[in-house]
């Protein structure tokens, strides 16, 4: 009996009720491998999901997220709301990053600015809600008499562009 079932190709199932006949998968279902005892129900891309690839008798549907959302989890199992750069998603919606943190993407959490002094460096460009700080040479490298091929750019205030 098992041997008869192993002959059933993808897109069919081995029908125990009909003496191991290979029956085609019914509408809205698929089998991606041969020898299956059942066809599986196609995934449906509804709500915040949109269809990237339609279901066929041999392969499941694939979903993406609609505009304003991004995929999470294996095979886009969840859609999470996008936020702007400089924000993170909380239970109450998108919130600006707290001072000292940044997020340069539409997803994920706000992360602390790099602490330049831990590497013995100085802040070259201040951080913003959207961007991490840029670390420059160490203060010692900037002391009088130290050689530097290019003078360091002046540090600027968060959100300001150089004049």
């Amino acid at each position: 009996l098992q041997d008869l079932c192993s002959n059933c190709p993808a897109g069919t199932f081995c029908d125990n009720n009909r003496s191991q006949i290979c029956s085609p998968c019914p509408p809205n279902s698929f089998s991606s491998a041969g020898g299956q005892r059942t066809c599986d129900i196609c995934r449906q891309c509804k709500g915040v999901f949109k269809t990237r690839k339609e279901c066929s008798s041999t392969s499941n549907a694939e979903c993406d997220c609609i505009s304003g959302y991004h995929c999470l989890g294996a095979e886009c199992s969840m859609c999470e709301q996008d936020c702007k750069q400089g924000q993170e998603l909380t239970k109450k919606g998108c919130k600006d990053c707290c001072f000292g943190t940044f997020n340069d993407q539409k997803r994920g959490i706000c992360r602390p600015w790099t602490n330049c002094s831990l590497d013995g460096k100085s802040v070259l460009v201040n951080g913003t809600k959207e961007r991490d700080v840029v670390c420059g040479p160490s203060p010692a490298d900037l002391s009088p008499g130290a050689s530097s091929a290019t003078p360091p750019a002046p540090a600027r205030e968060p959100g300001h562009s150089p004049q």
């Epitope: 199932f13 081995c14 029908d15 125990n16 009720n17 029956s23 998968c25 019914p26 509408p27 809205n28 279902s29 491998a33 299956q36 005892r37 059942t38 066809c39 599986d40 129900i41 196609c42 449906q44």
Partner: antibody, heavy 121, light 106 residues
């Protein structure tokens, strides 16, 4: 005879998780799909999702995608459902039910006795 | 999702009476399954694929219908038929159930 035996009643606090089991006997576990259903007091029966124990493939009612996780252990012929972030509306009887794997009709021919979950602070 | 509406919600019948329970679908479905549930028990498979009686179901029960309208009929109702009857579809994901018809036998 064919039987589905479910784990005992659970009382949980809001925000907690619960994992219930459904042990199958009397048939070949991998030849049938296992479905989970919810029956809340005074509400209609709701389908949560199913697992194909042969492949591990799962398909969920979108209403439960975020909080229900279905798994199966072929070695013990047991299916599991974990429900997370519990709230009072999750208070219900949860049933496992098998569907004939060689039928295209998706008909629940055998049901477990149900697991009662009470969510209360 | 496909919504199944059962009518009536509640029916009272006397023994030997003919009882008809209707299940209407919001969109056309290929077939309907029926389940019987008694208080304190799990639902039981009763009729599959519109008209096939499950093992052990008395022949006084029958099922019929197509498209959006389906019926479960009990020809000469008996006291043991007192229960709630549910219809179910899977022509479209997700599986959905009617909210049940409670049958009381006087």
């Amino acid at each position: 005879q064919v039987q589905l035996v479910q784990s005992g009643a659970e009382v949980k606090k809001p925000g907690a998780s619960v994992k219930m089991s459904c042990k199958a006997s009397g048939y070949t576990f991998t030849f049938y799909t296992m479905h989970w259903l919810k029956q809340a007091p005074g509400q209609c029966l709701e389908w949560i999702g199913y697992i194909n124990p042969s492949s591990g493939y799962t398909n969920y009612n979108q209403k439960f995608t975020d909080r229900a996780t279905l798994t199966a252990d072929k070695s013990t012929s047991t299916a599991y459902m974990e429900l997370s972030s519990l709230r009072s509306e999750d208070t219900a009887v949860y049933y496992c039910a098998r569907s004939d794997g060689s039928s295209s009709k998706w008909y629940f021919d055998v049901w477990g006795q149900g697991t009662t979950v009470t969510v209360s602070s | 999702e496909i919504v199944l509406t059962q009518s009536p919600d509640f029916q009272s019948a006397t023994p030997k009476e003919k009882v008809t329970i209707t299940c209407r679908a919001s969109s056309s479905v290929s077939y309907i399954h029926w389940y019987q549930q008694k208080p304190g028990s799990s639902p039981k498979a009763w009729i599959s694929a519109t008209s096939n009686l499950a093992s052990g179901v008395p022949s006084r029960f029958s099922g019929s219908g197509s498209g959006t309208s389906y019926t479960l009929t009990i020809n000469r109702v008996e006291a043991e038929d007192a229960a709630t009857y549910y219809c179910q579809q899977w022509s479209s994901n997700p599986f959905t159930f009617g909210c049940g018809t409670k049958l009381e036998i006087k």
